[in-house]
Interface confidence: low
């Protein structure tokens, strides 16, 4: 036969605890019902009457089963660099998260306390690791044969265009400039290219000076790596 079910309020057996969604009231010395999320204890239980619950007032909430005398106050309104991703209701606190282009520099239990703009990689640097809700963009210098000519928190380093005839060689912050015939890009593997000038690939050359008006035959000179700290703006 099943054990007899006790209804709240009831005195627990010595050494036993109250059941799920019940609490032990020290004054009444009884197991009493908790209030559901969105409610609070209006009247505490006695030996003969159970907890009386009431709905939370506007701008207050309880998220858990509880026996608190007053609901918690919802957090303040979201700031201009934030968006409200969860409204203040009787059962949940307001949650503010960072708007697009920003990340959370200082988080709180739920949502974000302080948002900061995502780092922008300056020309010559591209995004190595995109920003997330909680982490900033990581920039890296564009490797030889690639460039970025933008100040951006999203642009990666792109390959230089492959020219039939190079007017100005590309560098980390500028695409190659072609002349005469139309260029082809070295995007797809197996792409057919016309013969090109042999690229000089010595490992530790210094950045090339601004090209003169004379055409250059060495159009893939590796750039000396710039320190990553210099690759961003807005710090």
């Amino acid at each position: 036969l099943p054990a007899q079910v006790a209804f709240t309020p009831y005195a627990p057996e010595p050494g036993s605890t109250c059941r799920l969604r019940e609490y032990y009231d020290q004054t009444a010395q009884m197991c009493c019902s908790k209030c559901s999320p969105g409610q609070h204890a209006k009247v505490f239980c006695t030996k003969t009457s159970d907890t009386v619950c009431d709905s939370c007032e506007d701008s207050t909430y309880t998220q858990l089963w509880n026996w608190v005398p007053e609901c918690l106050s919802c957090g303040s309104r979201c700031s201009s660099d934030q968006v409200e991703t969860q409204a203040c209701t009787r059962e949940q606190n307001r949650i503010c998260t960072c708007r697009p282009g920003w990340y959370c520099a200082l988080s709180k239990q739920e949502g974000c306390r302080l948002c900061a703009p995502l780092r922008k990689c300056r020309p010559g640097f591209g995004v190595a690791r995109p920003g997330t809700e909680t982490s900033d963009v990581v920039c890296k210098p564009c490797a030889p044969g690639t460039f970025s000519n933008t100040t951006s928190s999203t642009d990666i380093c792109r390959p230089h265009q492959i020219c039939n005839v190079v007017a100005i060689p590309g560098n980390a912050s500028m695409d190659a400039v072609c002349t005469s015939t139309s260029p082809t890009r070295s995007m797809a593997p197996g792409a057919v290219h016309l013969p090109q000038p042999v690229s000089t690939r010595s490992q530790h050359t210094q950045p090339t000076p601004e090209p003169s008006t004379a055409p250059s035959t060495s159009f893939l000179l590796p750039m000396g790596p710039s320190p990553p700290a210099e690759g961003s703006t807005g710090d």
Partner: antibody, heavy 127, light 109 residues
Framework: QSLEESGGGLVKPEGSLTLTCAVS?????????ICWARQAPGKGLEWIAC????????AYYASWAKGRLSISKASSTTVTLQMTSLTAADTATYFC????????????????????WGPGTLVTVSS | IEMTQTPSSVSAAVGGTVTINCQSS??????LAWYQQKPGQPPKLLIY???YLTSGVPSRFSGSRSGTEFTLTISDLECDDAATYYC????????????FGGGTEVVVK
């Protein structure tokens, strides 16, 4: 502990039917919710509605079922599902299932894990 | 909430392993159940809250979650495991239906 559905059978289109779920081995109280689900022949499962086994009478429905299907607690051992304006698309085996609730102010049988099922009753809607 | 279950059918030999996936259209936390249903029988709850086995279910069954993607794995497959398996979002909100996936038939060779 078991559940058993009854009331199924052949019904004409636009007709009505009331299915009954009888519980045994446990009492319908606030510790349980009773839910209905259905399964068309050779098809998947579809949740319909749930009702508090306690005294609150709280019930909630799948969005498609609101208005046409009605769940109610008939007694301490039975829950019914009233169905109106039936169509051929309602042809299915109808199951009742139990969801464990919680002691106290259990507004919802949450989360809804159907841990005890009846064998089902077949409803055929055809002229 | 929509639950997309794949594959619709899978076949494996006795002693093998099968994996069934269920993708939720919304974040349902870990509120997901897996059921086993054999022909002419009601479903049987195997796993609840994404990874917890119900009493009496062998440990050959396991569930996991990664974001909104859930997986049921049956290892050391037995003939008795031949059935249709359903995932179900058990997430309750007043606007969300408790939704079942389309089902996966497991054939044991």
């Amino acid at each position: 502990q078991s559940l058993e559905e009854s009331g199924g059978g052949l019904v004409k289109p636009e007709g009505s039917l009331t299915l009954t779920c009888a519980v045994s081995g446990f009492d319908l109280n606030s510790y349980y919710w009773i839910c209905w689900a259905r399964q068309a022949p050779g098809k998947g499962l579809e949740w319909i509605a749930c009702i508090d086994g306690g005294s609150t009478g709280s019930a909630y429905y799948a969005s498609w079922a609101k208005g046409r299907l009605s769940i109610s607690k008939a007694s301490s051992t039975t829950v019914t599902l009233q169905m109106t304006s039936l169509t051929a698309a309602d042809t299915a085996t109808y199951f009742c299932a139990r969801v464990q609730s919680y002691v106290g102010y259990a507004n919802y049988g949450y989360p809804n894990y159907f841990n005890l099922w009846g064998p089902g009753t077949l409803v055929t809607v055809s002229s | 909430i929509e639950m997309t279950q794949t594959p619709s059918s899978v076949s494996a030999a006795v002693g093998g392993t099968v994996t069934i996936n269920c993708q939720s259209s919304e974040d349902i936390d870990s509120y997901l159940a897996w059921y086993q249903q054999k022909p002419g029988q009601p479903p049987k709850l195997l796993i609840y809250h994404a990874s917890y086995l119900t009493s009496g279910v062998p440990s050959r069954f396991s569930g996991s979650r990664s974001g909104t993607e859930f997986t049921l794995t049956i290892s050391d497959l037995e003939c008795d495991d031949a059935a249709t398996y359903y995932c179900q979002s058990a997430y309750y909100s007043s606007s969300a239906d408790n939704t079942f996936g389309g089902g996966t038939e497991v054939v044991v060779k």
